[in-house]
């Protein structure tokens, strides 16, 4: 009787995510059968959340309105390591959308989900932020120093990645 | 008071060459991104190629791009627009315009333009 | 590209009434609240003007009788009562995505 109401509301949380994600790749959490985590296929998944890097070349806000349609934001990087994750999914040659932007123009960065912008834990290219217009930052590779983060116009097409919490049924 | 004064049109025949110069005063100049934006006899507004403030990014509509280049010298408060391979559908006023960013926003409108120079593709 | 559609091409209006332009963008230009709609005047040999950004917002020392309304596809560029000197075409312009892209223009002129 337990399991099978267990596995209804997990039918039915399952139904929530359908409209947007017609297929979840899940994995056993721990040694507990009961708990699961998803992502939604084929999404990469990082301690709590999800990936999805969007190839499509689209302004900031368009990036934005696209992941927040599949109940994802905008990256926003929190960590170093989970850094060093999202780059291995990504092309040397390209640049890609983060969650992060300054509507003012006056260097007060924000990230999409209200995250505090902590100057400690940034990974702005050497130089960077250098353009009160460009109140969008991207990720991109740069031979002299890697990865890294740089400021650019807000209207340039770019390719993006999204991120939400990790699906747990 | 703001000012853009373009300059370098003419007539020009059909796969030549021209470059387009805007002389900018009266702001600081290395502090906004630029656009040039040509209009056709009698037709609309067309952009053609902006260049941020330090010169660092370009971008330019398909119609153009491979033939036109943007560019910009801080110290001289100047942008051009170099034209090659000229066509007869280039023909068209250029103006340079000012690129102004909504205060606590993320888009731009042109707010200050120059009067034009004409720029003739004809064999 | 962003493809932006105003209505009407041409417009005849008498003195002290009102006009009315329309502009339709292909798709969403909003965010957050905001909006990349942007409207010039231009008379005849002269540049552009701008005349109101970010959808509403009046640039200085423009005349309160012009307005914009309007979010997402569809924006209102009105003169309340026009006046002589607004004979011009008025063009839309949005800036939400590159290219950014004008509309074909409505000329305004005195029935």
């Known amino acids: 009787n337990f399991m099978y109401s267990k596995t209804v509301k997990r039918l039915s949380k399952l139904r929530e995510y359908q409209q947007y994600h017609p297929s979840l790749t899940c994995v056993m959490e721990g040694k507990d059968i009961e708990d699961w985590s998803c992502c939604p296929t084929p999404w990469t998944s990082f301690q709590s959340s999800c990936y999805f890097i969007s190839t499509g070349m689209q302004s900031w806000t368009k990036s934005q309105k696209n992941c927040s349609v599949m109940g994802a934001d905008l990256v926003v990087i929190n960590t170093r390591e989970e850094q060093d994750f999202i780059i291995q999914n990504l092309k040397r040659n390209s640049s890609y959308f983060l969650g992060l932007s300054d509507p003012g123009g006056r260097r007060h960065w924000q990230w999409v989900d209200q995250t505090p912008y902590n100057e400690n834990v940034t990974f702005w290219h050497s130089g960077e932020p250098n353009n009160l217009d460009e109140r969008c930052a991207i990720i991109n590779f740069r031979s002299s120093e890697e990865w890294g983060w740089n400021d650019i116009h807000c209207h340039v097409p770019q390719k993006s990645i999204c991120k939400m919490k990790k699906i747990y049924i | 008071e703001v000012q853009l004064v373009e300059s370098g049109g003419g007539l020009v025949k059909p796969g030549g060459s021209l470059r387009l110069s805007c002389a900018a005063s009266g702001f600081t100049f290395s502090s906004y991104t630029m656009s040039w934006v040509r209009q056709a006899p009698g037709k609309g507004l067309e952009w053609v190629a902006y260049i941020s403030s330090g010169g660092g990014q370009t971008y330019y509509p398909d119609s153009v791009k491979g033939r036109f280049t943007i560019s910009r010298d801080n110290a001289k408060n100047s942008l051009y627009l170099q034209m090659n391979s000229l066509r007869a559908e280039d023909t068209a006023v250029y103006y340079c315009?000012?690129?102004?960013?909504?205060?606590?926003?993320?888009?731009?409108?042109?707010?200050?333009w120059g009067q034009g120079t004409l720029v003739t593709v004809s064999s | 590209d962003i493809v932006m559609t105003q209505s009407p091409d041409s417009l005849a209006v008498s003195l002290g009434e009102r006009a009315t332009i329309n502009c339709k963008s292909s798709q969403s230009v909003d965010y957050d609240g905001d909006s990349s709609m942007n409207w010039y005047q231009q008379k005849p040999g002269q540049p552009p003007k701008l005349l109101i950004y970010a959808a509403s917002t009046l640039e200085s020392g423009v005349p309160s009788r012009f307005s914009g309304s309007g979010s997402g596809t569809d924006f209102t560029l009105t003169i309340s009562s026009l006046q002589a000197e607004d004979v011009a075409t008025y063009y839309c312009?949005?800036?939400?995505?590159?290219?950014?892209?004008f509309g074909g223009g409505t000329k305004v002129e005195i029935k």
């Open positions: 312009q949005q800036t939400n995505e590159d290219p950014p892209t």
């Open positions: 315009a000012r690129h102004d960013y909504y205060e606590g926003g993320l888009y731009y409108a042109m707010d200050y």
